[in-house]
Amino acid sequence: EVEKTACPSGKKAPEIDESLIFYKKWELEACVDAALLATQMDRVNAIPFTYEQLDVLKHKLDELYPQGYPESVIQHLGYLFLKMSPEDIRKWNVT
């Protein structure tokens, strides 16, 4: 798990964009808002995050949705789906 650290000045992500590939894992944890991530999940799959970075993004979504992801997020998981465990998937209420 990534240690909780304050986001450095000027690094707060205003949107999910390609520059985030350069963010270290602790910067992603500190500087990417989970609610923003959830609303811009369609962009995540178009950005070549490393698998370790995807772990951080998954952790943020898990904190935001401890009872399971909404369908709007599930539909746009893309590569992030590879990080899902059977336990994660069992929480989903997919119709």
Partner: nanobody
């Protein structure tokens, strides 16, 4: 195969400017990321600035506001404009290009992600 060659290093006084160039050849498709790293004696190689295939930029905290990364697609060249140089900027500067098809590494700020490297160019800032 991508070949990467840096140039533009040198010896300057603190407060001066330098522009490094990184010419790449070997293919026409641009890699996912081009980056400038630096390595000071006895220290790890660290990311200075990065540029994505879409033109998005990233700077390390230590150079933000002083360094600018840019590219000239027609010349297949990436530049690092370094202004207000400090003694602490002294290092060998490396240009790197990467696609990272296996999505390995902790992030694109990690040198292990990049497949193609130049030989480096020395930048020395005297105080």
């Amino acid at each position: 195969e991508v070949q990467v060659v840096e140039s533009g290093g040198g010896l300057v006084q603190a407060g001066a400017s330098l522009r490094l160039s990184c010419a790449s050849s070997g293919r026409t498709i641009s890699p996912i990321a081009m980056a400038w790293f630096r390595q000071a004696p006895g220290k790890e190689r660290e990311l200075v600035a990065g540029l994505t295939w879409t033109g998005r930029t990233y700077y390390s905290d230590s150079v933000k506001g002083r360094f600018t990364i840019s590219r000239d697609n027609a010349k297949n060249t990436v530049y690092l404009q370094m202004d207000s140089l400090k003694f602490e900027d002294t290092a060998v500067y490396f240009c790197a290009a990467g696609d990272n098809p296996d999505r390995r590494g902790s992030s694109w700020s990690s040198s292990s992600v990049y497949e193609y490297w130049g030989q480096g160019t020395q930048v020395t800032v005297s105080s």
